[in-house]
């Protein structure tokens, strides 16, 4: 993400964006898209991105959608370097124990976890 | 995961395993693993997966510790299980929109997103 | 009210360089994008390009690149339109419009006559 | 590039016929935009979407269409109709025109 917008101000003009173009983008009824079932949000952002592509290639252009397409893309490069991040850093077994338990913590507090 | 096993007590009890072990655990002190580097745990769960079969393949078995290992890969199927269901379900634009931006939404408010 | 107020008529000699504006009131330019299109006496309509106000982003037609430049000033809320090298094949009319979420809104036009 | 052939060039129709002018892609595209133009106007945005009328547009006027083959249609010609009708894809750059369907009116 080029240093001059911060990722949280992109996050915020994308979502403005996408609230204004929303009637455009549905304009395309026949259309179907992979939408996950649950709401574990970062567990799927592959298959949200490939979506965004779909979108895409579906939606007229030389409108401000574009600037969407384009926040979008920033977006997954953003978010491509942080999967980057997961496994950059060797660590002392106690750091790495501090990193699961805050993870299956988080799990426990914030996922959403359908009953069985 | 076994339907008698709820996600979300598998995941208190790992929790409750993992301080249990915790001074065994850390007995290598010359062991190093991929820490990731930022809190979108939801990013790494491949690379806290890799970490733990590397913890798992250099820690003394038996007891509960194996508990521990066989909890954790539950929750690492489990995980598996809401990956397959991100792309499972194809729907129309509008239900992804309402995803993308809860998405980005979730993003916006949850995510620990650094500052540039 | 949205309006774009395109320059006046303007009579240039062969090879010289012209420049058009088309000012905006009722809206910002920075929120949409800004296309400019030529027409030839008695013929159609041909896409020359379009910028993104909010960071200069251009797009030409391939037959227009080299030949015009677009431009736009934030702070006057007005494009530009800069030809070169003018021929008799320039003479044209010539178009503003703004294309938001659609290309609602024209400006009036500018003739643009080449001729010794 | 798309290249859109419209047709047919010229028409006339009398006030209250049907009319309906096609709008041809070299390739497939999503939607087609049309536009009206009148002598010594403008052009005004008609139809967005191959079929949403652009705001003040008459009910009598219609669009229809997809991938290759579009088509404008008005149900009972007015005299006001009467105009040169210009068809666009926004797919893929450069985004281009048709070359216009003049309807006069008889």
């Known amino acids: 993400i080029p240093t001059e917008i911060p990722a949280s101000a992109l996050v915020k003009e994308t979502l403005a964006l996408l609230s204004t173009h929303r009637t455009l983008l549905i304009a395309n009824e026949t259309l179907r898209i992979p939408v996950p079932v649950h709401k574990n949000h970062q567990l799927c952002t592959e298959e949200i991105f490939q979506g965004i592509g779909t979108l895409e290639s579906q939606t007229v252009q030389g409108g401000t959608v574009e600037r969407l397409f384009k926040n979008l893309s920033l977006i997954k490069k953003y978010i491509g370097g942080q999967k980057k991040k997961c496994g950059e850093e060797r660590r002392r077994v106690n750091q790495f124990l501090d990193y699961l338990q805050e993870f299956l913590g988080v799990m426990n507090t914030e996922w959403i976890i359908e009953s069985h | 995961i076994p339907t008698e096993i709820p996600a979300s007590a598998l995941v208190k009890e790992t929790l409750a395993l993992l301080s249990t072990h915790r001074t065994l655990l850390i007995a290598n002190e010359t062991l190093r693993i991929p820490v990731p580097v930022h809190k979108n745990h939801q990013l790494c769960t491949e690379e806290i997966f890799q970490g733990i079969g590397t913890l798992e393949s250099q820690t003394v078995q038996g007891g509960t510790v194996e508990r521990l290992f066989k909890n954790l890969s539950l929750i690492k199927k489990y995980i598996g299980g809401q990956k397959k269901k991100c792309g499972e379900e194809r729907r129309r634009v509008n239900q992804f929109l309402d995803y993308l931006q809860e998405f980005l939404g979730v993003m916006n408010t949850e995510w620990i997103i650094e500052s540039h | 009210e949205v309006q774009l107020q395109q320059s006046l008529a303007e009579l240039v000699r062969p090879g010289a360089s012209v420049t058009l504006s088309c000012t905006a009131s009722?809206?910002?330019?920075?929120?949409?994008?800004i296309h400019w299109v030529k027409q030839r006496p008695e013929q159609g309509l041909e896409w020359i390009g379009r910028i993104d106000p909010a960071n200069g982003d251009t797009k030409h037609g391939p037959k227009f690149q080299g030949k015009a430049t677009i431009t736009a000033d934030t702070s006057s809320n007005t494009a530009y339109l800069q030809f070169s090298s003018l021929t008799s094949e320039d003479t044209a009319i010539y178009y503003c419009f703004r294309y938001g979420i659609y290309p609602d809104h024209w400006g009036q036009g500018t003739p643009l006559t080449v001729s010794s | 590039q798309i290249v859109l052939t419209q047709s047919p060039a010229l028409m006339s129709a009398s006030p209250g016929e049907k009319v309906t002018m096609t709008c041809s892609a070299s390739?497939?595209?999503?939607?087609i935009y049309w536009y009206q133009q009148k002598p010594r106007s403008s052009p005004k945005p008609w139809i967005y979407l191959t079929a949403t009328l652009a705001s003040g547009v008459p009910a009598r006027f219609s669009g229809s269409g997809s991938g290759t083959s579009f088509s404008l249609t008005i149900s009972r010609m007015e005299a006001e109709d009467a105009a040169t009708y210009y068809c666009?894809?926004?797919?893929?750059?450069?985004?281009?025109f048709g070359g216009g369907t003049k309807l006069e009116i008889e």
């Open positions: 009722g809206f910002n330019i920075k929120n949409t994008y």
């Open positions: 390739s497939s595209v999503n939607y």
């Open positions: 666009q894809q926004w797919n893929s750059y450069p985004y281009t």
